[in-house]
Structure formats: structure tokens, C-alpha cells
């Protein structure tokens, strides 16, 4: 059988400053067990953008309903985009453990920020 895939369908997204950016991510299986997290950038210096369980991410909302059963849509919306938000965003599946370990990453979505229309 095929193992879980993390699908980020958009290679790039362009958003005007002040608008919201939707970053799409779906997975193809509910297993292995473990959370999805979003990061900007790759490697050890990557920045955590959203972790559903812990942390405070006031500009981030999840696209799927919080009560949706068997959810495989882990898309997020980031509000009030500024030029500082530009970068490549990765949707990452973790395998549950102590600690959780990275299982598979999406290919990334590059967010570019256009000037706010005058």
C-alpha cells in the first residue's frame, strides 16, 4: 500500500500586503499517528508558523472546520500579510512519539507579497 503523502498543490502564492494568504495542504492518509505543523523555511532555523496543540498564533486560522471528522485538509490562512511574511512555507507531518519526529514534508509553497494597492 502507499504511505502517506503530504500535498501542497500551490508552488507559489502571491498576496497583496494587508490581505490574507491561504496555504493549501492535504494528506492522503490518517496514519501514521501524529500532528501536522506548518513552518517557514527549512532546516534547523525554520520558523514555526502553526502548531495546533501549543503556542499562540493569532494571525493563523485553520481552513477546515474544527469539528470535521477524519480531516485530511490542513490548509491555513494567515491574515494581514506584510513583506516580512515572504518565504517558503512547508506543511510537515510528524510521527507521534517522545518527542514527535518529522515523518514527511510537503514540497513547499513560496509566498510573495505585492505592494498594497493604492
Amino acid at each position: 500500500e502507499e504511505e502517506l503523502q503530504v500535498i501542497q498543490p500551490d508552488k507559489s502564492v502571491s498576496v497583496a500586503a494587508g490581505e490574507s494568504a491561504i496555504l493549501h495542504c492535504t494528506v492522503t492518509s490518517l496514519i501514521p499517528v501524529g500532528p501536522i505543523q506548518w513552518f517557514r523555511g527549512a532546516g534547523p532555523a525554520r520558523e514555526l508558523i502553526y502548531n495546533q496543540k501549543e503556542g499562540h498564533f493569532p494571525r493563523v486560522t485553520t481552513v477546515s472546520e474544527s469539528t470535521k471528522r477524519e480531516n485530511m485538509d490542513f490548509s491555513i490562512s494567515i491574515s494581514n500579510i506584510t513583506p516580512a511574511d515572504a518565504g517558503t512555507y512547508y506543511c510537515v507531518k510528524f510521527r507521534k512519539g517522545s518527542p514527535d519526529t518529522e515523518f514527511k514534508s510537503g514540497a513547499g509553497t513560496e509566498l510573495s507579497v505585492r505592494a498594497k494597492p493604492s
Epitope: E1, E3, L4, T28, S29, L30, I31, P32, V33, G34, P35, I36, Q52, K53, T62, S64, E65, S66, T67, K68, R69, E70, N71, F74, R95, K96, G97
Partner: antibody, heavy 120, light 108 residues
Framework: EVQLVESGGGVVQPGGSLRLSCAAS????????MSWVRQAPGKGLEWVST??????YYADSVKGRFTISRDNSKNTLYLQMNSLRAEDTAVYYC???????????????WGQGTLVTVSS | EIVLTQSPATLSVSPGERVTFSCRAS??????IAWYQQKPGQAPRLLIY???SRDTGIPDRFSGSGSGTDFTLTISSLQSEDFGVYYC??????????FGGGTKVEIK
Amino acid sequence: EVQLVESGGGVVQPGGSLRLSCAASGFSFSIYAMSWVRQAPGKGLEWVSTIGADDTYYADSVKGRFTISRDNSKNTLYLQMNSLRAEDTAVYYCAKDSTVGWSGDFFDYWGQGTLVTVSS
Amino acid sequence: EIVLTQSPATLSVSPGERVTFSCRASQNVRSDIAWYQQKPGQAPRLLIYAASSRDTGIPDRFSGSGSGTDFTLTISSLQSEDFGVYYCQQYYDWPPFTFGGGTKVEIK
């Protein structure tokens, strides 16, 4: 219709072994986590083990003695129980895991259970 | 390990009465609580998940509420088929998944 049917229970002596099976139908077995939950006679529910893909999780009380596995080609969940003790006597339920939103897991379908009795 | 404490252990109720069950967690579990009903000789049945969402086919006389550490299951008007034992379960932090000790509902 989701169906979970356990088998393999019985009477075994302390230190013995049993293998429980759970035949699943009515859903895409291979993409769901599956669990075993037990209930000692007259007692409450106790989680035993969960399996995702090849990721497995155990209660401390059974760690090192029980092994959970699955055969997706047969839509079957297993629990290999070794070094059985009197306190393992219980009805063992197979359960399908469910998730909600970005969170999980709880158990939305249960089998009818199979009784394991450990006694000399 | 998160400990769930259910109270009372037993409730004696007459059909038609409103029934409230309590489940208290030893630490914050957000809304990651499920409720199950178990009748004698039967497997548990999922009633409520995410603290307040009814499972498919569950009558609307069953409702759940709460978040953090204190949760409630309410049956607005108890029917004869509602007698049994009710368990809460947390899935916020596992392993292990933990269940409350149960509340038995018996006929007064």
C-alpha cells in the same frame, strides 16, 4: 456498514500466550489507526494499544508483553499477548480510531469483544 | 498521565428526568474529550466527541459541554434505553488514552 469482529479469546494459564484477531469491514481499513481496549470483569475501560501505519503505542501495563500488528491486505488487526497474567483477564475490544479537525484520537466503532481468562 | 474523575459513581434516576454527569481532568485537555455509553453485555458506543459534538445518529437529548478541565454530559429527558454506564475519555495527551471510572445510571 462498519463491522469489527474479534476472535481468539479463551482460557489460558498464567505465563501463556494468545493471539487475538479483529476482522474489519465497511471502511478503508488501511488509512485508519486501530486500537485495543479492554475491560476487566465488573471494571471500567482500559486502553491497551494503538497502531497507525508501522507506529505502535502501548499501555505501560502491557509493554514488552503484548504486540499489536495489522495486515491491510486482510483488513485484520491482531494482538499477540505473551506472558499473560491473572490481571490481564478481561473482555478485549477492537476499536476503530477517529479524528476530528486537527486532533485525535477517539474510538467511533467497537467490536463486540472477546473474553480472555488467565487462570490456572 | 492525565487522570479523569467522574462523578457521581452511581445515579438513581426516573425516566423523564434530566441527568447530568461530570468528568474532571487532572490537567487541561482543551476540548479533547469523548463520551461513551455502555449497556450491560454490550460494547461501548460513542456519543459525543470534541466535548460537545454528537456522533451520527445520537439523539439530541444527549449534549456535552465544557473545556479545559471540567466537562459535562447531559441527558435532557432520560429514556428507558439510556440506562447503563457512561464513560469519558481524553485524547489530548497520549499514550496513554485514559478513561474516567464511569457513572452508572440505574432506575430509581
